[in-house]
Amino acid sequence: SEVEYIAEVGQNAYLPCSYTPAPPGNLVPVCWGKGACPVFDCSNVVLRTDNRDVNDRTSGRYWLKGDFHKGDVSLTIENVTLADSGVYCCRIQIPGIMNDEKHNVKLVVIKPAKVTPAPTLQRDLTSAFPRMLTTGEHGPAETQTPGSLPDVNLTVSNFFCELQIFTLTNELRDSGATIR
């Protein structure tokens, strides 16, 4: 099952993944890979951590900007392009046979939305973003249609992943567009 996240070309994409170190400070290796989680490890690795720090990044655009030492291993991809679209695997490599937690997150990169005058803004956004978030068969199905463009902060507990989607609200406010 995949959690879906939308980002605009040129912006930073945030792909959430976290775990709770037990006991606190007892970190485990984590890898992020492009493509659905395979049987073992990560294929097409974009970033890897060991028990202490990030030790492998395939590009300077990949970052862990959260509190890594508290188990926030959410991936930030800077300056995304359409080629960054696709499924990413966050694999929390808990010691033991077949103990890994595997989280698939789908990144959808879109071209920047055109900010139009207020009367057509809501209609354009609704047609452009009919589905802000969907989760797979094992997770809660949520559909956000941006009528009032709310901020969403959803915790998908069965993935131990906290998905935070900050909609276009703030950007639109900053642009001076009217939101109704």
Partner: antibody, heavy 116, light 107 residues
Framework: EVQLVESGGGLVQPGGSLRLSCAAS????????MSWVRQAPGKGLEWVAN????????YYVDSVKGRFTISRDSAKNSLYLQMNSLRAEDTAMYFC?????????WGQGTLVTVSS | ETVMTQSPATLSVSPGERATLSCRAS??????LAWYQRKPGQAPRLLIY???TRATGIPARFSGSGSGTEFTLTISSLQSEDFAVYYC?????????FGGGTKVEIK
């Protein structure tokens, strides 16, 4: 250049044992999972076993569980497969492969023949 | 386990022609599928991984497609060195499994 060189194959009687070795070079051995894959005469490829970078996890196809043991020595850049209680159906060419879930580099293989 | 079925078992093609090989999985393997080429007396060679990504040094005439349960390997214009046996392999589900192979022979 990545190189994987297998050795240790040969003719063995049913119930016997063999130890295969694979010498790796040209890459950071300790950074990769490693696998053994085999191909019986006239048959297709079959994954046999693999081992994590630090040796902490090992996985086997059901048909060899309890009989085969995979191990590695990162100081020697070597991978091993200890094969006990060998059966006629274990007759195959055994390949050592670098494991990225898919197998991006392979050795030339070593032939194991189990026959009385 | 995930059973991988390849078809046809044998494909007779003339040099310069297009070859299309099929691989079907008994359950979804997402895009976690690889293709290999095996020639007699040689080690298998990785051609494609992640369903459609060519491995290092693989000519552009080899291409892969598909996701879920249906996959295709296409050789756009067969060269003499392409006559071999081709295997698909899934790495989405445990255990790792291969297809039975497709032999591409000269027509």
């Amino acid at each position: 250049e990545v190189q994987l060189v297998e050795s240790g194959g040969g003719l063995v009687q049913p119930g016997g044992s063999l130890r295969l070795s694979c010498a790796a070079s040209g890459f950071t051995f300790s950074s990769y999972w490693m696998s053994w894959v085999r191909q019986a005469p006239g048959k297709g490829l079959e994954w046999v076993a693999n081992i994590k970078q630090d040796g902490s996890e090992k996985y086997y196809v059901d048909s060899v569980k309890g009989r085969f043991t995979i191990s590695r020595d990162s100081a020697k850049n070597s991978l091993y497969l200890q094969m006990n209680s060998l059966r006629a159906e274990d007759t195959a060419m055994y390949f050592c492969a670098r494991d990225s879930n898919f197998f991006d580099y392979w050795g030339q293989g070593t032939l194991v023949t189990v026959s009385s | 386990e995930t059973v991988m079925t390849q078809s046809p078992a044998t494909l007779s093609v003339s040099p310069g022609e297009r070859a299309t090989l099929s691989c079907r999985a008994s359950q979804s393997v997402s895009s976690n599928l690889a293709w290999y080429q095996r020639k007699p007396g040689q080690a298998p060679r990785l051609l494609i991984y992640f369903s459609s990504t060519r491995a290092t040094g693989i000519p552009a005439r080899f291409s892969g497609s598909g996701s879920g349960t249906e996959f295709t390997l296409t050789i756009s214009s067969l060269q003499s060195e392409d006559f071999a046996v081709y295997y698909c392999q899934q790495y989405n589900n445990w255990p790792l499994t291969f297809g039975g192979g497709t032999k591409v022979e000269i027509k």
